[in-house]
Interface confidence: low
Amino acid sequence: SERCDDWGLDTMRQIQVFEDEPARIKCPLFEHFLKFNYSTAHSAGLTLIWYWTRQDRDLEEPINFRLPENRISKEKDVLWFRPTLLNDTGNYTCMLRNTTYCSKVAFPLEVVQKDSCFNSPMKLPVHKLYIEYGIQRITCPNVDGYFPSSVKPTITWYMGCYKIQNFNNVIPEGMNLSFLIALISNNGNYTCVVTYPENGRTFHLTRTLTVKVVGSPKNAVPPVIHSPNDHVVYEKEPGEELLIPCTVYFSFLMDSRNEVWWTIDGKKPDDITIDVTINESISHSRTEDETRTQILSIKKVTSEDLKRSYVCHARSAKGEVAKAAKVKQKVPAPRYTVELACGFGAT
């Protein structure tokens, strides 16, 4: 017979929830590990079991589903807290099994506290808005499934500590927050507080996200190679160190992969025998345009190395460019003392 398929602790799903707020947590087995859903499993006679290990303890315990007002409950493949308490923090395990099958996964749940300005250790999602790009919206995240569509919650939006009222270019519209024209000054943390009734009680859901204003696709250009260029010649004597920077500017492009690489005589540096090192540094502008610099270095260059072709390449979703560096061997200066001696040699 097979052992329980133990997926271990799924730290990719580091779940954080606010103290004293409802939380609904789906068993990750069905979302990320198994090829069937809860309904299929349930119809096949499999049982979903939950247990947990408290923070700083190593004792696995059953979850107490008999708390007053059903504070913790399970509904299909969802574990509900109505609401959470600080000491609910721990590793939670959901296990699917019958007598012939078993699969389980654990995940960390952290209940965090927030202050009156919504500051907390919560890791915040980032929403990018294009600069000066027309009306753009953000939506209050992760509130689906908390209340039925018949319930009409109230939603209040905040920027940092301040309730958004009479802002110039930011307008609350229920679950959405509209930016009429996004500017760098709109960078910051935005919080929606959703309030809804359930069984005679009032619950609050607090969701904070970071807005980052980035370069607009309207202004995006293919990569621009600033160096190497036609004005700089890398003139070296054999035995000297050759250093050639490749500096490339990339416009911000959502989900674009920016790449920079060198070729030497048409080959990647890894594919040739010379002792070459490449160091890369990256910097960003306020709108997340990117400048990448890759410095090609040959510690003791040979006369053969100085005859090679060194080309910097760059690629983004907007296109690909390349530029060759001008490399040449320094011509030695005439050694006059010797020449004079020879010239006046025999008369």
């Epitope: 247990y51 004792l59 696995e60 315990e61 059953p62 099958y101 078993c102």
Partner: antibody, heavy 119, light 111 residues
């Protein structure tokens, strides 16, 4: 103080049945998996069966069909029903508590009850 | 079924000695291993679970290591009360059982 106390061990003839009990005090039985481990005279420990907190039970392969573990949470008692006993079942039977709902490691043990199968 | 093989079956040592007992599983059991100590006429006592985690109240001279199939229990400096028999146990989940097979035991006696 948490205590586990086994009872029901005695001399029994081969082929007969016997039920062992383990009375648990100081904890809620339904919060833990519980198990039985036996030890023949002068020999090592041998796993018999475990019942998880939610009632799934797991017998050692040699015990299947002859030994059945059960629990009555309302009486805070664990049982081991042993049928078709053989001479090689002679042992001290320990009742033990799992560290949690289903960890496999047993952190609290009773003092054991002796079962002797002999004609 | 998983078979647990413990070695040595007995060893003689003196107070202050460093003692190492090994346990081998017939197949990969991850870190699903516990170690117990048993003295004559007494019930076993849990020392280590999860291959390396010390159970509550167990002195720090006991340590466990290993994963997969090979495991070790080490007593860094043997004390008079440590003369006993030590057992490893597979605690790996299985639909047929939780926990399971014990090793044959290692008896630590006074040299």
């Amino acid at each position: 103080e948490v205590q586990l106390e086994e009872s029901g061990g005695r001399v029994v003839q081969p082929g007969r049945s016997l039920r062992l009990s383990c009375a648990v005090s100081g904890i809620d039985l339904d919060n833990y998996a519980m198990g039985w481990v036996r030890q023949a005279p002068g020999k090592g420990l041998e796993y018999v069966a475990v019942i998880s907190s939610d009632g799934f039970f797991y017998d050692a392969s040699w015990a299947k069909g002859r030994f059945t573990i059960s629990r009555d949470n309302s009486k805070n008692t664990l049982y081991l029903q042993m049928n078709s006993l053989r001479a090689e079942d002679t042992a001290v039977y320990f009742c033990a508590r799992d560290r949690g709902t289903s960890t496999g490691s047993l952190d609290l043990w009773g003092q054991g009850t002796l079962v002797t199968v002999s004609s | 079924d998983i078979v647990m093989t413990q070695s040595p079956s007995s060893l003689s040592a003196s107070v202050g000695d460093r003692v190492t007992i090994t346990c081998q599983a017939s197949e990969n059991i991850g870190n699903g291993l516990a170690w117990y100590q048993q003295k004559p006429g007494q019930a076993p006592k849990l020392l280590i679970y999860g291959a390396s985690t010390l159970a509550s109240g167990v002195p720090s001279r006991f340590s466990g290591s290993g994963s997969g199939t090979d495991f070790t229990l080490t007593i860094s400096s043997l004390q008079p009360e440590d003369f006993a028999t030590y057992y490893c146990q597979c605690t790996y989940w299985n639909p047929d059982y939780i926990g399971g097979a014990f090793g044959g035991g290692t008896k630590v006696v006074i040299k």
